[in-house]
Amino acid sequence: TPEVWVQVRMEATELSSFTIRCGFLGSGSISLVTVSWGGPNGAGGTTLAVLHPERGIRQWAPARQARWETQSSISLILEGSGASSPCANTTFCCKFASFPEGSWEACGSLPPSSDPGLSAPPTPAPILRAD
């Protein structure tokens, strides 16, 4: 069964700057990745970035830089200032549309006891929804 993992890290240099990394553990071809915060995309969450393998990347503040790390994983850096900046208990979600498996989504947040600059290892997060 395909799985999605989510890793959230707070940057040591900027305490309100976050890096979100997400990956897809499955055999299919990724057709679209959507990163959101505040809950799953389409269920109260707000889209931060959408990544398409051929057509490129779209991102919305406070997202600063979204990019592909591998063919099945992405990273997103969030700007750490302003009213819309994330806080330590913010939930981030990644939805991978995979061809032909369908859509798989998981969420994660900063580990409760993590020090700035540290993060939990990228273990598979619970799958919230598979369309």
């Epitope: 071809s29 057709s31 889209t47 057509r55 779209r58």
Partner: antibody, heavy 117, light 107 residues
Framework: EVQLVESGGGLVQPGGSLRLSCAAS????????MHWVRQVPGKGLEWVSD???????YYLGSVKGRFTISRENAKNSLYLQMNSLRAGDTAVYYC????FGYGMDVWGQGTTVTVSS | DIQMTQSPSSLSASVGDRVTITCRAS??????LGWYQQKPGKAPKRLIY???SLQSGVPSRFSGSGSGTEFTLTISSLQPEDFATYYC?????????FGGGTKVEIK
């Protein structure tokens, strides 16, 4: 209600210029890619240009360097500046919305551009 | 550029008929494909997105299938209001490209 309303079409001579506008309402404009698609009367549909939420632009090869797509998110407006117009640019031009990666879903009613001497 | 070859270019059918329209992509596009209906003097209207998902408000007699390079739009029981021209659109890569269209006429 989600709505797209084009304006600015008309008759122009070959080599001339025209600026099309599209007024969007009923949705969060800045969250969507916006496209221009054209159709020669009685013929098929042809994609012309796309602009991303932050202003990334993409063009059909035959219009690159002559057409410029732009947007004003604060005004919920999309534009197409068309220069060095040719007879082959004669068409109905549609403004179209896309939730990026999911395809075009909402179309305006179109505005007609005629390039003729 | 990805070419979308749509067939047939026109067809004649009767109310109640099952109608099938095909689009073939010149290279794989996964499921980045939509189907549109256009009536004379009107803007196109989306029927199907992601190759097989029905657009909200569209009657269930319309269905889409396929992936990769071969795609099909099926109208299970043609109704009088379905006589129109149908187009496929690939949004997998730039430039986005439409099929040539299929005009569905009354027999």
């Amino acid at each position: 209600e989600v709505q797209l309303v084009e304006s600015g079409g008309g008759l122009v001579q070959p080599g001339g210029s025209l600026r099309l506008s599209c007024a969007a309402s009923g949705f969060t404009f800045r969250n969507y890619d916006m496209h221009w698609v054209r159709q020669v009367p009685g013929k098929g549909l042809e994609w012309v240009s796309d602009i991303g939420n932050s202003g990334e632009t993409y063009y059909l090869g035959s219009v690159k360097g002559r057409f410029t797509i732009s947007r004003e998110n604060a005004k919920n407006s999309l534009y197409l500046q068309m220069n060095s117009l040719r007879a082959g640019d004669t068409a109905v031009y549609y403004c179209v919305r896309e939730e990026f990666g999911y395809g075009m879903d909402v179309w305006g009613q179109g505005t007609t551009v005629t390039v003729s001497s | 550029d990805i070419q979308m070859t749509q067939s047939p270019s026109s067809l004649s059918a009767s109310v109640g008929d099952r109608v099938t329209i095909t689009c073939r992509a010149s290279q794989g596009i996964r499921n980045d494909l939509g189907w549109y209906q256009q009536k004379p003097g009107k803007a196109p209207k989306r029927l199907i997105y992601a190759a097989s998902s029905l657009q909200s408000g569209v009657p269930s007699r319309f269905s889409g299938s396929g992936s990769g390079t071969e795609f099909t739009l099926t109208i299970s029981s043609l109704q009088p209001e379905d006589f129109a021209t149908y187009y496929c659109l690939q949004h997998n890569s730039y430039p986005l490209t439409f099929g040539g269209g299929t005009k569905v006429e009354i027999k």
